[in-house]
Interface confidence: low
Amino acid sequence: LPKAPVITTPLETVDALVEEVATFMCAVESYPQPEISWTRNKILIKLFDTRYSIRENGQLLTILSVEDSDDGIYCCTANNGVGGAVESCGALQVKMKPKITRPPINVKIIEGLKAVLPCTTMGNPKPSVSWIKGDSPLRENSRIAVLESGSLRIHNVQKEDAGQYRCVAKNSLGTAYSKVVKLEVEVFARILRAPESHNVTFGSFVTLHCTATGIPVPTITWIENGNAVSSGSIQESVKDRVIDSRLQLFITKPGLYTCIATNKHGEKFSTAKAAATISIAEWSKPQKDNKGYCAQYRGEVCNAVLAKDALVFLNTSYADPEEAQELLVHTAWNELKVVSPVCRPAAEALLCNHIFQECSPGVVPTPIPICREYCLAVKELFCAKEWLVMEEKTHRGLYRSEMHLLSVPECSKLPSMHWDPTACARLPHLDYNKENLKTFPPMTSSKPSVDIPNLPSSSSSSFSVSPTYSMT
């Protein structure tokens, strides 16, 4: 008797690995024998499609080599003209072992910046990604995170982050490892031990000691009163990324000796400076017209702007010069919170060097004013708009009386470095090379009222490292 088709083994979900065989079975009872057709995602599978094999009168569908794109819903439909057609459906889930499609690469980065090591993966189920540093699993913390993409992000890179890394992609079907890559952390030159000032008798021997560190290990040069040291012997040793330099001097005159540590990062250099004064005992008799004294800057607000242990002029017209000048900067610093990111570092450098002027230690300690060219660079180039506002406030008396020092310097009254390079102080933060300075975006479209001479670069490829400019 004729019998309508009945599917006796409904299709089930089939899991298959890529490149393996996957088979769906659709057993049908009917009379006469039915015609069985197959669809994938409601699209008919053609009998002559060579990727499939259809056997047992259509009851077996075999995918000969599973691909990623074979994922989907497969249905068999049986019809023999008796009763209605019947259908059964099942899913094919293509499983895939983890595969790293974008492996990490070697990275060289400066301490304090952000590093990202890529690790993009594919697989089904979606692989989980973890990282190994050296021989141990890497633990995430507030600085170190594995991103959704699998990449490793390290904020504020530290020296101890340097090492060998590899990423591991894992799912229920297996594990994939990337090749080992190296994260190298470079560190700006930093002075660990600054030379100490000495008050000695004429003809004494003095050894100045300067220790610096950085990655790569910095070189140390000594400067005497602004020039390369012409006499004295220098001994150096390097151990554990620390360079130790000793300058032995025979003292016949007072002087300011600066230790400069320099290291290279790609095409750029970073420098750190520390200075010591050598004074001769008989020369330091106080004089009536002495309006201040030289001392190492021990304050806080200008730490990021002035060289560490910079020798600054402290004005004795204040009862407590150090605290009074510090308070002046502190109060003014707050004004700078509202200026543009282009202006702010330049203004901070100008402010700190204006209030804590570089000091020339001699018979009479003398403040060294800022060079006119640097003042003009801040006024006309970096802070044109802001400068107008400041001048307006100063003229209208909007600054409180104790802020008299903060009336913006009159650039035209400052000495030019072209007259006497030692008579005025530079702002190292503005010592870009000429190319950088030319491309720096001015804050105004109007033409500067004074021609700004090109600022000299210390060497064709060097620059001065600007630390973070922030009250906190």
């Epitope: 530290q158 806080e300 109060t331």
Partner: antibody, heavy 121, light 112 residues
Framework: ELQLVESGGGLVQPGGSLRLSCAAS????????MSWVRQAPGKGLEWVSA????????YYKESVKGRFTISRDNAKKTLYLQMNSLKSEDTAVYYC??????????????WGQGTLVTVSS | QAVVTQEPSLSVSPGGTVTLTCGLS?????????PDWYQQTPGQAPRGLIY???SRHSGVPSRFSGSISGNKAALTITGAQSEDEADYYC????????????FGGGTKLTVL
């Protein structure tokens, strides 16, 4: 990993002394200001003392001036708080905290787990 | 000695917005006080949230924001979550003859 680990707390009689230490690791210690902050049981936070990166100056809460001394040894990456003439109101958990820059009064961006100081007879 | 004032307690519904304030018993809070905000959950050390009025510490979710509103510093939590239930302290830098740092009494925030 940045870590601040306080030690030296304990039970002491009124008028006695204690020296707290804070061992720092995972960051360049000599580039940051540091502070001590305390918290009496069930009470709020109270700033005690601060010191900039170079130890060039020190700052104290009025009630501890002359009794407490903050200091640092950058070579040992350690911050100290010498507490003399202790009073019962000094009982608290003492936290060592890192400032976010070189200055003594930057924001506190990392804290230790604290060490308990109990002043009682 | 100036006293730093905060609301003793506040509550917010999950997903809601709440503003905590930090004032001075005498005078106004300005950006010269560099207001900082800290969060402390029971049994834990405090953690920095906001520094210098409105800058977020790294790792702090963007739902926390700081500002100065009127004569007070303010911490706003937009889209509060259950894990935001904690004590919140503000800290102010003071300068009156000598430098000082003062915490407020703290605000107990409950996420209902």
């Amino acid at each position: 990993e940045l870590q601040l680990v306080e030690s030296g707390g304990g039970l002491v009689q009124p008028g006695g002394s204690l020296r707290l230490s804070c061992a720092a690791s995972g960051f360049t210690f000599d580039d940051y200001g540091m502070s001590w902050v305390r918290q009496a049981p069930g009470k709020g936070l109270e700033w005690v003392s601060a010191i900039p990166w170079n130890g060039g100056s020190t700052y104290y809460k009025e009630s501890v001036k002359g009794r407490f001394t903050i200091s640092r040894d950058n070579a040992k990456k350690t911050l100290y708080l010498q507490m003399n003439s202790l009073k019962s109101e000094d009982t608290a958990v003492y936290y060592c905290a890192k400032r976010s820059g070189r200055i003594a009064f930057g924001a506190l961006d990392a804290w230790g787990q604290g060490t308990l100081v109990t002043v009682s007879s | 000695q100036a006293v730093v004032t905060q609301e003793p307690s506040l509550s917010v519904s999950p997903g809601g917005t709440v503003t905590l304030t930090c004032g001075l018993s005498s005078g106004s809070v300005t950006s010269s006080n560099y207001p900082d905000w800290y969060q402390q959950t029971p049994g834990q050390a405090p953690r920095g949230l906001i520094y210098s009025t409105d800058s977020r510490h790294s790792g702090v979710p963007s739902r926390f924001s700081g500002s100065i509103s009127g004569n007070k510093a303010a911490l706003t939590i937009t889209g509060a979550q259950s894990e935001d239930e904690a004590d919140y302290y503000c800290g102010l830098y003071m300068y009156s003859g000598s430098k000082n740092y003062v915490f407020g009494g703290g605000t107990k925030l409950t996420v209902l």
